[in-house]
């Protein structure tokens, strides 16, 4: 007799995990045999899907391989064309160890900002998520929060939050990790010790020191009057993220000094700046009084006669002092290039010393002149022809500009170092030496005056000139 | 030799003025720098002034505005005016060669401020 | 101004010792371009004008016995008279010229 299909196995509740067999039995009493169809959330399987296998006239349902996204309400509809089609349905859940979908990755950020570092994940049951810094687990606080998604929030980022962070997905099933990524926190640049301001004597040696930190540890610069330091030494050294830096400075004239610290963060730059001011005691007085200043020597033709950073006065009666007194130089000095090899290192140290007079500390920065004694022995014994020679040119009036006169002194109007040896300037390229061979007689060729010793004073009456006339 | 001869100290009330005059002799006098330093009884030397080659004066705190400095190359002759002398300035009163040491003295000369 | 301290204020000695004067400047006397020191000592016996024994802190003056030497820098100076004679009783000053020029106090020497 025909009989009406009845469902005696109802579809139940079906957990699989991804990858495994899922199957779903919907047995069927009915005469004639019915057809029996599948439906996953009310859309028909169709019988040729390769992922499904449909068996036992219909009443076996087999998913091969599941995937996450097979998780649904599956039906079984059982017609035979006797009373009315019949329907059971059952859930597939499919179970899933944690999987981390959207891991977090490196991130830099700016102290004070927030910082998000994202872990999406999946899995079922619904994994939970922890993070790990360094080795321990991380402690959430009033600043730290992991989100809903498992995302790691922290605001107001601060140094000691930078460091290695890994997310943790975790469920009944298993657990997942995800790679070690770097929170880098960058600190703009900020100045823990700014310079200080000096009132220092003329001539002196002065040291500022800046300090500064950041993230990246910062550079600094050194700005005088506005401009990066010409001249000076800088000393620098990093520890602990800190960094020293000393300027050393000889004092010729006063200046603001400005430290400016300085870092990058992408493309763009973090700067802070402290300043210091070093005046000179009674400063104006060398320029009132004593028609010109003291200055280092920045010039190039006395260079190699002339003592590393020598102060040396330049005349204010010219307009630019510098300019003036080097064309004055340079115009002597090419004259000098036909002399003998005897008389040019002499006359050379003799004419950048005269020029550009050494300057003296006292009361008042004062240039000192050359001593008479080496004056007299670039004329009277190194360069006895040659000045000769131009003194007679000199009376026939051979020379078109006096510029090359004022190069050259007046021996007798230059102080003796024999009644005070701290009067004048001794030109060192001149001095005795009793290991050097090229020794010279004592001059004779004219008769000093009563207040012109021999040179040198005590130690020997012979002169010499550095080996192969050296004037480095 | 160089020598060095002071004169024109004495006895001057406070409030007074003197003027002392050293003659150099035996060096160059126009080429050199000059100064004035003086000795209280009993007590430590005190620098205060000096004149450089182009007679530009530079002086001690102490006596600055009171007491001037002065050359006279053709002389060689070295001055100092001392005014509104007070009774603390009373010293022995030394002529002094020298730029950066003080390389040549004089024997001195007497000045008390007493009334 | 710049301030010499000098000690002791007096020493006595017996003819052949040796003799250490010190010196200190309230700020260093060294001039950066020269790099010399910018300090003297002098010598004045009783009843007589000082003299110059050594300048730039080391340089002894002509004339001036070999005893006498003078070593030091930046702040600290000594003169040191390495085998005293009778008419070395004196007193001895230091005095710096790096600026306006100031004296020490002064050591009185007296020979035993």
């Known amino acids: 007799l025909p009989k009406a299909p009845v469902i005696t196995t109802p579809l139940e509740t079906v957990d699989a995990l991804v990858e495994e067999v899922a199957t779903f039995m919907c047995a069927v009493e009915s005469y004639p045999q019915p057809e029996i169809s599948w439906t996953r959330n009310k859309i028909l399987i169709k019988l040729f899907d390769t992922r499904y296998s449909i068996r036992e006239n219909g009443q076996l349902l087999t998913i091969l391989s599941v995937e996450d996204s097979d998780d649904g309400i599956y039906c079984c509809t059982a017609n035979n064309g006797v009373g009315g089609a019949v329907e059971s349905c059952g859930a597939l859940q499919v179970k899933m160890k944690p999987k981390i979908t959207r891991p977090p990755i490196n991130v830099k950020i700016i102290e004070g900002l927030k910082a998000v570092l994202p872990c999406t994940t999946m899995g079922n049951p619904k994994p939970s998520v922890s993070w790990i810094k360094g080795d321990s687990p991380l402690r959430e606080n009033s600043r730290t929060a992991v989100l809903e998604s498992g995302s790691l929030r922290i605001h107001n980022v601060q140094k000691e939050d930078a460091g290695q962070y890994r997310c943790v997905a975790k469920n009944s099933l298993g657990t997942a990790y995800s790679k070690v990524v770097k929170l880098e926190v960058e600190v703009f640049a900020r100045i823990l010790r700014a310079p200080e301001s000096h009132n220092v004597t003329f001539g002196s040696f002065v040291t500022l020191h800046c300090t500064a930190t950041g993230i990246p540890v910062p550079t600094i610069t050194w700005i005088e009057n506005g401009n990066a330091v010409s001249s000076g030494s800088i000393q620098e050294s990093v520890k602990d993220r800190v960094i020293d830096s000393r300027l050393q400075l000889f004092i010729t004239k006063p200046g603001l000094y400005t430290c400016i610290a300085t870092n990058k963060h992408g493309e763009k730059f973090s700067t802070a700046k402290a300043a210091a001011t070093v005046s000179i005691a009674e400063w104006s007085k060398p320029q009132k009084d004593n028609k010109g200043y003291c200055a280092q020597y920045r010039g190039e033709v006395c260079n190699a006669v002339l003592a590393k950073d020598a102060l040396v006065f330049l005349n204010t009666s010219y307009a630019d002092p510098e300019e003036a007194q080097e064309l004055l130089v340079h115009t002597a000095w090419n004259e000098l290039k036909v002399v003998s090899p005897l008389c040019r290192p002499a006359a050379e140290a003799l004419l950048c010393n005269h020029v550009f007079q050494e300057c003296s500390p006292g009361v008042v920065p004062t240039p000192i002149p050359i001593c008479r004694e080496y004056c007299l022995a670039v004329k009277e014994l190194f360069c006895a022809k040659e000045w000769l020679a131009m003194e007679e040119k000199t009376h026939r009036g051979l020379y078109r500009s006096e510029m090359h006169l004022l190069s050259v002194p007046e021996c007798s109007k230059l102080p003796s170092m024999h009644w005070d040896p701290t009067a004048c300037a001794r030109l060192p390229h001149l001095d005795y030496n009793k290991e050097n061979p090229k020794t010279f007689p004592p001059m004779t060729s004219s008769k000093p005056s009563v207040d012109i010793p021999n040179l040198p004073s005590s130690s020997s009456s012979s002169f010499s000139v550095s080996p192969t006339y050296s004037m480095t | 030799e160089v020598q060095l001869v002071e004169s024109g100290g004495g006895l001057v009330q406070p409030g007074g003025s003197l003027s002392l005059s050293c003659v150099a002799s035996g060096f160059t006098f126009s080429l050199y720098y000059m100064n004035w330093v003086r000795q209280a009884p009993g007590k430590g030397l005190e620098w205060l002034s000096v004149?450089?080659?182009?007679?530009?004066?530079y002086y001690a705190d102490s006596v600055k505005g009171r007491f001037t400095i002065s050359r006279d190359n053709v002389k060689n002759t070295l001055y100092l005016q001392l005014n509104n002398l007070k009774p603390e300035d009373t010293a022995l009163y030394y002529c002094v060669l020298g730029r950066t040491a003080l390389v040549r003295w004089g024997q001195g000369t007497q000045v008390t401020v007493s009334s | 101004d710049i301030v010499m301290t000098q000690s002791p204020s007096s020493v006595t000695a017996s003819v052949g010792e040796k003799v250490t004067i010190n010196c200190k400047s309230s700020q260093s006397v060294v001039f950066g371009s020269n790099q010399k020191s910018y300090l003297n000592w002098y010598q004045q016996r009783p009843g007589q004008s000082p003299r110059l024994l050594i300048y730039?802190?080391?340089t002894q003056e002509s004339g001036i016995p070999d005893r006498f030497s003078g070593s030091g820098s930046t702040t600290d100076f000594t003169l040191t008279i390495s085998s005293v004679q009778p008419e070395d009783a004196a007193v001895y000053y230091c005095q710096q010229a790096y600026s306006a020029p100031t004296f020490g106090s002064g050591t009185r020497l007296e020979i035993k």
């Open positions: 004149i450089d080659t182009h007679s530009i004066a």
């Open positions: 730039y802190a080391s």
